[in-house]
């Protein structure tokens, strides 16, 4: 039960995280005009990964896409790449994890296969989350650097007569969405990896059957495992387990009339 819960929760958390990464990538507010200690203007600027926008006090908003690829800063391209890689890995991870879910039965898929798929999706979620966190952090670092550079020469005088106000940009909402979403995807991935450990049987949990041969009893364990002789310890038809107490989830289940596909 605990493994199913951990796997299901990991899937849901990752799903929310990836949705957040997609939302952050699409958002226009990666950087917003810094209003603190700035002359009050009737125009508000904000920028995303794909376009920059200007919202006038009159209520009209105009957005312009970055219709160049080569003219964009390398850092911005890197952030775009990291976010896209994060989304792609996350999407593949979601697809894999759907089939890996213990509550979903596909044909006669063994638990070992589900365990492998759970681990794969978990790793994908972890990498996806790290990509998003890295992308957002690179952008944030870029903003901080530019902020202090523009603060240093905020007012560039023209002959001491005319002043040009330089627009400074600070963290936009998308950065926080990205950090939280990346973190959730990472946590979801870790949960999937933990669930995988519970799904993977260390030894196959078949019940052992004792056969009483003439002279001495030998308990046979089906499945190619070493048979144990019954001298001494296990002569009274005891069930042989592969060691240690196990949860309900870890005992292999078989389809019954109550199972739903």
């Amino acid at each position: 039960m605990a493994v199913t819960a951990c796997q299901g929760l990991g899937f849901v958390v990752s799903l929310i995280g990836i949705a957040g990464i997609i939302a952050a990538t699409c958002m226009d507010q990666w950087s917003t005009q810094d209003l603190y200690n700035n002359p009050v203007t009737a125009v508000f600027n904000y920028q995303g990964l794909w376009r920059s926008c200007v919202r006038e006090s009159s209520g009209f908003t105009e957005c312009r896409g970055y219709f160049t690829l080569l003219g964009l800063p390398a850092m911005l391209q890197a952030v775009r790449a990291l976010m896209i890689v994060g989304i792609v890995l996350g999407a593949i991870g979601l697809l894999v994890s759907i089939f890996a879910l213990k509550c979903i039965r596909i044909g006669s898929m063994e638990d070992s296969a589900k365990a492998n798929m759970t681990l794969t999706s978990g790793i994908m979620f972890i990498v996806s989350g790290l990509c998003a966190i890295a992308g957002v952090s690179v952008f944030a670092n870029m903003l901080v650097t530019n902020f202090w550079m523009s603060t240093a020469n905020m007012y560039t005088g023209m002959g001491g007569m005319v002043q040009t106000v330089q627009t400074r940009y600070t963290f936009g909402a998308a950065l926080f969405v990205g950090w939280v979403a990346g973190g959730l995807t990472l946590i979801g991935g870790v949960m999937m990896c933990i669930a995988c450990r519970g799904l993977a049987p260390e030894e196959t949990n078949y019940k052992a059957v004792s056969y009483h041969a003439s002279g001495h009893s030998v308990a046979y364990k089906p499945g190619g495992f070493k048979a144990s002789t019954g001298f001494g310890s296990n002569t009274k038809n005891k069930k042989i387990y592969d060691g240690g107490a196990r949860t309900e989830d870890e005992v292999q289940s078989y389809p019954s009339k109550h199972d739903y596909v």
Epitope: P39, A42, G59, F60
Partner: antibody, heavy 117, light 113 residues
């Protein structure tokens, strides 16, 4: 079509307050801002303040302490209230719609206000 | 507050003549986000409210004759009337619509000889 019409008292005694109403039609106050501008006789234009679509306001710094702009969206009316009037507040008072580029594209015909005892 | 300086204060012209008037702001009205200068031009005929001619320093308002052209960026702006008509005799005001409070220039009066 877009129309703005100012209505005021015409004559105001010094140190009294002024209230002007701008009634708009042809557009919604939830979508556009409205600005108040005045023009003393034979002089230039002076922007008093703006009330934006969202309800936030910006005032002329020199008049901020005695100026108040509000609106009633349901009645499509914008109000200008000015306290402690002096003779130099005598002017033609206009209301105008704020459009693209924060420009004032439609103006009312104005209401003349004379501050005199 | 932003100071808007218009020159000349008055211009005497004849019909068909090309006219240029200037407007300077004490701070740049150029917005880096969209590379637009937030300056507007208005025409005010005697006894009438102002009429919008140009916004974003160079965008002509619909219905305004194409003889009116706005140019300039940052702090220096120009309004040009390519061929003055009798109905163009009015006062022309420039306005800063970038910084609060919005401020007007003192105006340029266009007069006939």
């Amino acid at each position: 079509q877009v129309q703005l019409k100012e209505s005021g008292p015409g004559l105001v005694a010094p140190s009294q307050s002024l209230s002007i109403t701008c009634t708009v039609s042809g557009f919604s106050l939830t979508s556009y801002g409205v600005s108040w501008v005045r023009q003393p006789p034979g002089k230039g234009l002076e922007c008093l303040g703006v009330i934006w679509a969202g309800g936030n306001t910006n005032y002329n710094s020199a008049l901020m302490s005695r100026l108040s702009i509000s609106k009633d969206k349901s009645k499509s009316q914008v109000f200008l209230k000015m306290n402690s009037l002096q003779t130099d507040d005598t002017a033609m008072y206009y209301c105008a719609r704020v459009y693209y580029g924060n420009a004032m594209d439609y103006w009312g015909q104005g209401t003349s206000v004379t501050v005199s005892s | 507050d932003i100071v808007m300086t218009q020159s000349p204060s008055s211009l005497t012209v004849t019909a068909g003549e090309k006219v240029t008037m200037s407007c300077k702001s004490s701070q740049s009205l150029l917005n880096s986000g969209n590379q637009k200068s937030y300056l507007t031009w208005y025409q005010q005929r005697p006894g009438q409210p102002p009429k919008l001619l140009i916004y974003w320093a160079s965008t002509r308002e619909s219905g305004v004759p194409d003889r009116f052209t706005g140019s300039g960026s940052g702090t220096d702006f120009t309004l040009t009337i390519s061929s003055v008509q009798a109905e163009d005799l009015a006062v022309y005001f420039c306005q800063n619509v970038y910084f609060f409070p919005f401020t007007f220039g003192s105006g340029t009066k266009l007069e006939t000889k």
